[in-house]
Amino acid sequence: APVRSLNCTLRDSQQKSLVMSGPYELKALHLQGQDMEQQVVFSMSFVQGEESNDKIPVALGLKEKNLYLSCVLKDDKPTLQLESVDPKNYPKKKMEKRFVFNKIEINNKLEFESAQFPNWYISTSQAENMPVFLGGTKGGQDITDFTMQFVSS
């Protein structure tokens, strides 16, 4: 079945941009001017997920790369990773649960809750140049709010 997708960038609520840090990690840092071109472009897709009033299930791929954000247990802790997929088969409507995030959109702010691990969110640190990670607290030191910007082709 066809999947609705869009291309976008994400910045955390402190306006830090997301960039690649090695082949399988994202980090968050402040960018300006031409450096903004370093930021990752996501292909966000509307996928099948569990029902909830203000949660919309999405998958977050890296545009024109066969990489998707996924949530897995590592050393018994929910962990965010970039996972390689077969580009012939992705994106698809029925994504495996580890790839699914519940997008919560309130007042132009977005949160991305792991469908696999409820109450765990895509997060950034207050500090500069730190990895993007899966965090189990909301409203604490770590940042779970993002803004989205469409990317013009």
Partner: antibody, heavy 119, light 108 residues
């Protein structure tokens, strides 16, 4: 004030073209999904299509090929280009903002602009 | 494409009545359904989304229920301002978004 204003409607001959505009105020189109919905006189609502980023547009099956949605973020405006118009395209055309990305429902609507296709 | 069918097409009722409008999808759409109210010469207004969630500012006399392929919109006690045309809409699932044909609620 948050609002949408459509313009560009009018009388056009069959086979002709028309471009409708929808200008947003009070919010930025740089992160808002925008749809076009039409309503023929005395008839129901009919979804035309939706635009996310400029490369991500989706259309009703009947609109593909004849209708094109585009956006100019610098002007905070979305467009509906309509080609090869037919009498059955006569309708009020509304633009509407998606409530949340991929929600598929529309919480903010313009006042509509009437397109009449007739010779 | 998924087809949305509303019933009845026209409904006559009086102020204070409890009224129910039904919407049927040609296949399961889970709870991806919204309801709109439209008055003559005006744009539609979102009432309910995700089958049962009241949109901001909508009076609590409106309620929605259902999932799969059968949905209902209920107005618990009709007010004069409620006489209008109501539309259901399939909001998710695939690429196409589809509206029902509408139900005109008129004064008896």
């Amino acid at each position: 004030e948050v609002q949408l204003v459509e313009s560009g409607g009018g009388l056009v001959q069959p086979g002709g073209s028309l471009r409708l505009s929808c200008t947003a105020s009070g919010f930025s189109l740089s992160s808002a999904a925008m749809a076009w919905v039409r309503q023929a006189p005395g008839k129901g609502l009919e979804w035309v299509g939706i635009i996310y980023d400029s490369a991500s547009t989706y259309y009703a099956s009947w609109a593909k090929g004849r209708f094109t949605i585009s956006r100019d973020t610098s002007k905070n405006t979305v467009y509906l280009q309509m080609n090869s118009l037919r009498a059955e395209d006569t309708a009020v055309y509304y633009c509407a903002r998606e409530r949340a990305i991929f929600s598929g429902d529309f919480v903010l609507w313009g006042q509509g602009t009437l397109v009449t296709v007739s010779s | 494409d998924i087809v949305m069918t509303q019933s009845p097409s026209t409904l006559s009722a009086s102020v204070g009545d409890r009224v129910t409008i039904t919407c049927q999808a040609s296949q399961s759409i889970s709870s991806y359904l919204s309801w709109y109210q439209q008055k003559p010469g005006k744009a539609p207004k979102l009432l309910i989304y995700r089958a049962s969630t009241l949109a901001s500012g909508v009076p609590s006399r409106f309620s929605g229920s259902g999932s799969g392929a059968e949905f209902t919109l209920t107005i618990s006690s009709l007010q004069p301002d409620d006489f209008a045309t109501y539309y259901c809409q399939n909001t998710g699932g695939g690429i196409n978004i589809a509206f029902g044909q509408g139900t005109k609620l008129e004064i008896k």
